[in-house]
């Protein structure tokens, strides 16, 4: 949030302004709300439509912890459950992601016969 000094004869000297929230989809004309003590103001603002979205990915997931390293593939996996989707985003309910085990994990796995942790 932005803070701004205002000197227009009002009792409020420091307004705190929230983000510009488009009225339509992710960009274009919208409103920014400001507060100062008990006072609130709403002003018009614009989010340019050529900006990249600041809100992150269309699909947000909540992930479990990484599973154990699979020695045969050198990867480990975890599952994600859909937490939030942009209104028109057709997101999978659950996803599975994998990544390579670290070299440290691989060496531990070999040394401790599959009991390595990451």
């Amino acid at each position: 949030k932005k803070k701004e000094k205002v000197k227009k004869g009002s009792e409020c000297s420091e307004w705190t302004w929230g983000p510009c929230t488009p009225s339509s989809k992710d960009c274009g004309m919208g409103f920014r709300e400001g507060t100062c003590g008990a006072q609130t103001q709403r002003v018009h603002c614009k989010v340019p439509c050529n900006w990249k979205k600041e809100f992150g990915a269309d699909c947000k997931y909540k992930f479990e912890s990484w599973g154990a390293c699979d020695g045969s593939t050198g990867t480990k996996a975890r599952q994600g459950t859909l937490k939030k989707a942009r209104y028109n985003a057709q997101c999978q309910e659950t996803i599975r992601v994998t990544k390579p085990c670290t070299s440290k994990t691989k060496s531990k796995t070999k040394a401790k016969k599959g009991k390595g942790k990451d």
Epitope: S24, T81, A85, Y87, N88
Partner: antibody, heavy 117, light 107 residues
Framework: QVQLVQSGGGLVKPGHSLRLSCAAS????????MNWVRQAPGKGLEWIGM????????ILNQKFKDKATLSVDIAKNSAYLQMNSLRAEDTAVYYC??????????WGQGTLVTVSS | DIVLTQSPATLSLSPGERATLSCRAS??????LHWYQQKPGQAPRLLIY???QSISGIPARFSGSGPGTDFTLTISSLEPEDFAVYYC?????????FGGGTKLEIK
């Protein structure tokens, strides 16, 4: 499959407030947008607004900015619509619906709100 | 706000006939257009979403076309249970808006 059961409707006097409830069961309530729509007797459908249970992000039809307040209670798997300063023209059946762009939506059975003195 | 205009307001047909319902948007809404069926005393039921995508459990006789500003819901061969009111809805921008509805009645 998501099941939505609505409650809280009834007869209310002009100027009073009312809170409608929408209780969800089945698949994860917190992952999907919850819409509120109303339908006056013999009329078409009108969107009031929507809320996402995961973070309570709310998008309200500006027509209802001084009339409606949306909220959720994740612990109770429920969404709420608070309607203030009710007038005769707010008489309608109010629906909640859970929306996923991946699988479509599920609707509550609707609850009738009658504003009359 | 995006205005959705449905036509005709009333459509009188017989079972077995083909029904074509129109929905026109006041500006381009890509494919963010959905079709609902509503029967008296019931909540709306989603038939087609994103202009032409079918919904699980909805009979194959229902189909939709788009995108852009002109959208069509087609019922290839009417069954007695299809006589109801049909609404289009856009989700391209807020506020979400509905068309005024088309009443499909038995001739």
């Amino acid at each position: 499959q998501v099941q939505l059961v609505q409650s809280g409707g009834g007869l209310v006097k002009p100027g009073h407030s009312l809170r409608l409830s929408c209780a969800a069961s089945g698949q994860s309530f917190s992952s999907y947008w919850m819409n509120w729509v109303r339908q006056a007797p013999g009329k078409g459908l009108e969107w009031i607004g929507m809320i996402h249970p995961s973070d309570s992000e709310t998008i309200l039809n500006q027509k209802f900015k001084d009339k409606a307040t949306l909220s959720v209670d994740i612990a109770k798997n429920s969404a709420y619509l608070q309607m203030n300063s009710l007038r005769a023209e707010d008489t309608a059946v109010y629906y909640c619906s859970s929306w996923s762009a991946k699988r479509g939506d599920f609707w509550g059975q609707g609850t009738l709100v009658t504003v009359s003195s | 706000d995006i205005v959705l205009t449905q036509s005709p307001a009333t459509l009188s047909l017989s079972p077995g006939e083909r029904a074509t319902l129109s929905c026109r948007a006041s500006e381009s809404i890509s494919n963010n257009l959905h079709w609902y069926q509503q029967k008296p005393g019931q909540a709306p039921r989603l038939l087609i979403y994103y202009a032409s995508q079918s919904i699980s459990g909805i009979p194959a006789r229902f189909s939709g076309s788009g995108p852009g500003t002109d959208f069509t819901l087609t019922i290839s061969s009417l069954e007695p249970e299809d006589f109801a009111v049909y609404y289009c809805q856009q989700s391209n921008s807020w506020p979400l808006t509905f068309g005024g509805g088309t009443k499909l009645e038995i001739k």
